[in-house]
């Protein structure tokens, strides 16, 4: 209806004696600004006067008259929008209807607001969710339809009279729609909270109690159980009996079914609150609990650990690690099921007790080949001694041991022989798979670990072999000690240091580089003739006749070796000179005569000189002296002299006779 003023405010406001009331209010007048405002208490319209009768709590007029009540009641509004009011303090007799008489220039309006003031502070109201389940977070709400700026209050939560630890969130509303104070508490109830009293307490600013509301919690939860066992420590020996009892300490709603579990698995045909185990075996050791269900779900008791004690079972040995490499560390672990755990162990190696080893683990810091074998153990506890299990095998791997190179041939070995060697070893793990030889050669390996050297060389000194598995082990080199005839035999001149001159003392040495065996004999020969059996051949005074081709031989028990032929050269001055004449020593004049100076010299004659019967040197220096034509006056005795680097030699006289030709005789 467009003829109405528009107001917004809470329909009813609540307060109590001595508190205050704050009335949030807005309005919109039909025309213009507010000119007059009167607050009535329980107004009644008087038809006769066409005015409202009632107690005037507040009056605001143009002339500004204000009644004494003005101090208690305040109009906090304005002339066009806000009509908020405050009454402080509020009294019991303020209950009823408040009338807001509003007048503008041309229009009037009476707006009614209900005020409910109680004698004492009224209680807040606790709101709970429809269902509360254990461990599920819920929000508890405490609502009080009161809030006033001038009268601070607080809401506190209590559980069984004790303040709750959880932090509550308090909110207030002072709006045209609603006026309230609300406290919200987030809370995860446990089953133990079932049936407990929760209180929301209204307090003034000083914490003084004003009022409260209480509720009883109805926490839905799975059955809560207690398990009892006889004997109480749940430790028994095989053959003993055990009784377990399940007691329900709480269930909401009531429980429906009962069952028993061992190690999380349900035990068949066990649906009563008592579990009887007769003549228990070690297999019955484990964690037992009872399970009781209701509509919320199953509840489980705490677990009872039933220990059925027994002597150790046959043991097994675990080796870390096998196979083991020699020098590495190895750990042995004795494993035996027993209850209580074994307190003592006895260890065996290849059936023989290992002294001092009484613990679950045995540690060998450096494994050696003889540590290989079977390791077993026996475990012991208070109930007895177990049996020795089958044991575990320790395989110790190591390089081949005590490797030797062995010569198979009869000794001695001679150059050119075929030599067979074998590579032997004492032990190896894993097995030897290959062999190596040093030095390398184009040799034959007819079978694994055997080396054949065809036509063995004189210089094959030592051979070493290695036997290899995952590792190679080298033997010490073995000397072949090959025997051979003397080598590199040669003739060497010891003296003189320079060339040999006739008459010199001369020594020749028969040299060789090596011989095995070392014992040797020497032989000198010239032109097939044996000259001596020493390493040296000596000439006290060499003559040209000693020159020639010499050889020396060196022999040992294996054979003999000759040197290359060595030429002995003797240097001497020209000798045995003679003059020979051609065509003869008697030549007819006019013919040709050739005189030749013949000699024996080393080096050969380099220079000739010719002399006549008067020892007069002739102007000719070649070996031949040619007279052509020859004259009778050429007749006479001639001689020649030969010269080389060593010296000179002269010939005896040779006479040339030149006779007249028949023509000359005829002319005479």
């Amino acid at each position: 209806d467009s003829s109405k003023w528009v107001f917004e405010h809470p329909e009813t406001l609540y307060a109590w004696e001595g508190a205050c009331v704050w009335i949030p209010c807005t309005y919109r007048a039909l025309d213009g600004d507010l000119e007059s405002f009167i607050l009535f208490h329980n107004p009644e319209y008087n038809k006769n006067t066409s005015k409202f009768d009632g107690t005037r709590l507040y009056e605001s007029t143009k002339d500004g008259k204000v009644p004494s009540e003005q101090k208690r009641v305040q109009f906090l509004g304005d002339k066009n929008k806000n009509c908020t009011l405050s009454i402080h303090p509020v009294h019991l007799n303020d209950s009823g209807q408040l009338g807001l008489r509003m007048e503008s220039k041309t229009e009037k309006w009476m707006e009614r607001i209900h005020l409910n003031v109680s004698e004492r502070p009224f209680p807040p109201h606790i709101q709970l969710p429809p269902e509360i389940q254990e461990s599920q977070e819920v929000t508890l709400t405490c609502l009080l339809n009161f809030s006033c700026y001038g009268y601070p209050i607080q809401l506190q939560w209590l559980l069984e009279g004790v303040p709750m630890r959880q932090a509550a969130v308090t909110s207030t509303s002072l709006t045209i729609k609603s006026v309230f104070t609300r406290s919200e508490l987030k809370f995860s109830p446990q089953w133990s909270h079932h049936g407990k009293i929760v209180t929301c307490q209204l307090q003034d600013a000083d914490g003084k109690f004003l009022s409260n509301d209480t509720v009883q919690l109805n926490v839905k939860h799975t059955p809560k159980l207690e398990i009892k066992v006889t004997p109480s420590d749940a430790i028994v020996r095989e053959g003993d009996s055990v009784t377990m009892t399940c007691e329900v300490s709480s269930s909401n709603p009531e429980y429906t079914t009962v069952s028993w579990l061992k190690d999380g698995t349900s035990l068949k045909k066990q649906n009563t609150f008592t579990l009887n185990l007769r003549e228990v075996t070690k297999d019955q050791s484990g964690k037992y609990c009872c399970q009781v269900s209701n509509d919320v779900g199953p509840g489980r008791s705490e677990e009872v650990f039933l220990q059925v004690q027994y002597a150790p079972e046959p043991s097994t040995v675990q080796i870390l690690h096998s196979p083991a490499v020699e020098g590495s560390q190895v750990e042995f672990l004795c494993m035996s099921l027993a209850n209580p755990l074994p307190t003592n162990y006895t260890w065996y190696h290849n059936g023989k007790e290992m002294q001092g080893r009484t613990e679950e683990k045995v540690h060998i810091p450096k494994i050696l080949p003889w540590h290989a074998g079977t390791y077993s153990c026996v475990a012991e506890n208070i109930l007895g001694t177990g049996q020795r299990g089958p044991g575990a095998e320790l395989d110790v791997q190591y390089p081949p041991k005590k490797v030797t190179t062995v010569i198979q041939n009869p000794m001695p070995i001679r150059e050119g022989d075929t030599v067979t060697l074998s590579c032997n070893y004492n032990s190896s793990n894993p097995s030897v798979t290959r062999y190596e030889w040093k030095p390398h050669g184009a040799w034959e390996e007819p079978s694994l670990g055997v080396l054949k050297i065809q036509n063995v060389g004189w210089d094959n000194t030592t051979i070493a072999c290695a036997a290899c598995n995952s590792w190679c082990s080298w033997a010490s080199p073995v000397a072949l000690n090959v025997q051979y005839a003397p080598r590199d035999v040669r003739v060497r001149k010891i003296k003189p240091l320079s060339e040999i001159h006739s008459g010199n003392s001369v020594s020749l040495q028969c040299d060789f580089s090596s011989s095995h065996p070392k014992e040797v004999q020497f032989f000198w020969e010239k032109n097939g003739r044996l000259l001596g059996k020493e390493s040296q051949l000596n000439f006290d005074s060499i003559s040209p006749e000693d020159a020639g081709s010499y050889s020396c031989w060196v022999n040992n028990s294996i054979g003999q070796t000759a040197s290359k032929a060595w030429t002995l050269e003797v240097l001497y001055a020209p000798r045995r000179l003679r003059v020979s004449m051609s065509p003869g020593d008697q030549v007819m004049e006019g013919k040709s005569a050739t005189l030749t100076c013949e000699s024996d010299a080393n080096p050969p004659v380099s220079h000739y000189t010719w002399f006549d019967w008067n020892n007069q040197s002739l102007p000719y220096h070649s070996q031949k002296l040619r007279l052509e034509p020859v004259k009778v006056q050429h007749s006479g005795a001639y001689w020649c002299q030969g010269t080389n680097s060593v010296g000179k030699g002269r010939s005896p006289l040779s006479t040339l006779t030149v006779y007249y030709s028949p023509e000359t005789i005829g002319r005479r």
């Epitope: 001092g356 450096k366 540590h371």
Partner: antibody
Framework: EVQLQESGPGLVKPSQTLSLTCTVS????????ISWIRQPPGKGLEWLGV???????NYNSALKSRVTISKDNSKSQVSLKLSSVTAADTAVYYC???????????WGQGTTVTVSS | EIVLTQSPATLSLSPGERATLSCRAS??????IAWYQQKPGQAPRLLIH???TRQTGIPARFSGSGSGRDYTLTISSLEPEDFAVYYC????????FGGGTKLEIK
């Protein structure tokens, strides 16, 4: 590097208790057994007893009533106690490590103990 | 308790000669025997363990053999530095030393 250091008083009075300590390094007492050996002047070697890796002990039967060997693995120390000593207990005392199936290859220099009043 | 008897008590030889030292156990010691060399003022030095295994760094002239109760240490060709006291040790059942053999220069 394996090292052994025997220490203790060089002079002990007759009837008193001889106490020696062996401090080891380079290995653990949980891996090696330790034996005590002695050598009187001009005489041979005599084994006194052993403490095994697990802490058990065995002693030379001739000395069993007088000898005690103990150890502290965390301190790497082994101790020897020989009670009611006489001049015959004068010797060089060695502590030596060994393990199952392996002879003693590390010997310290030993410590000389003289029993005299 | 195992008893070890070493023989001879003294052995007089010249450098280059072969030395044979014996050790006899009162019962089978399963090859668990070691040989030590000791020089005056020094700690014993391990030569051979497990009857015949030469310790690292020990010259090849030292060798060991034997089984059961009887064991031998052989020095193939004596060097001047080999003259010392030699002890055998059994470690098959606890530990026992032999009385020693003194190897002296003839």
């Amino acid at each position: 590097e394996v090292q052994l250091q025997e220490s203790g008083p060089g002079l002990v009075k007759p009837s008193q208790t001889l106490s020696l300590t062996c401090t080891v390094s380079g290995f653990s007492l949980t891996s090696y057994d330790i034996s005590w050996i002695r050598q009187p002047p001009g005489k041979g070697l005599e084994w006194l007893g052993v403490i095994w890796t697990g802490g058990g002990t065995n002693y030379n039967s001739a000395l069993k009533s007088r000898v005690t060997i103990s150890k502290d693995n965390s301190k790497s120390q082994v101790s020897l106690k020989l009670s009611s000593v006489t001049a015959a207990d004068t010797a060089v005392y060695y502590c030596v490590p060994h393990y199952y199936g392996y002879a003693m290859d590390y010997w310290g220099q030993g410590t000389t103990v003289t029993v005299s009043s | 308790e195992i008893v070890l008897t070493q023989s001879p008590a003294t052995l007089s030889l010249s450098p280059g000669e072969r030395a044979t030292l014996s050790c006899r156990a009162s019962q089978d010691i399963n090859k668990y025997i070691a040989w030590y060399q000791q020089k005056p003022g020094q700690a014993p030095r391990l030569l051979i363990h497990y009857t015949s295994t030469r310790q690292t760094g020990i010259p090849a002239r030292f060798s060991g053999s034997g089984s059961g109760r009887d064991y031998t240490l052989t020095i193939s060709s004596l060097e001047p530095e080999d003259f010392a006291v030699y002890y055998c040790l059994q470690y098959d059942n606890l530990l026992t030393f032999g009385g020693g053999t003194k190897l002296e220069i003839k």
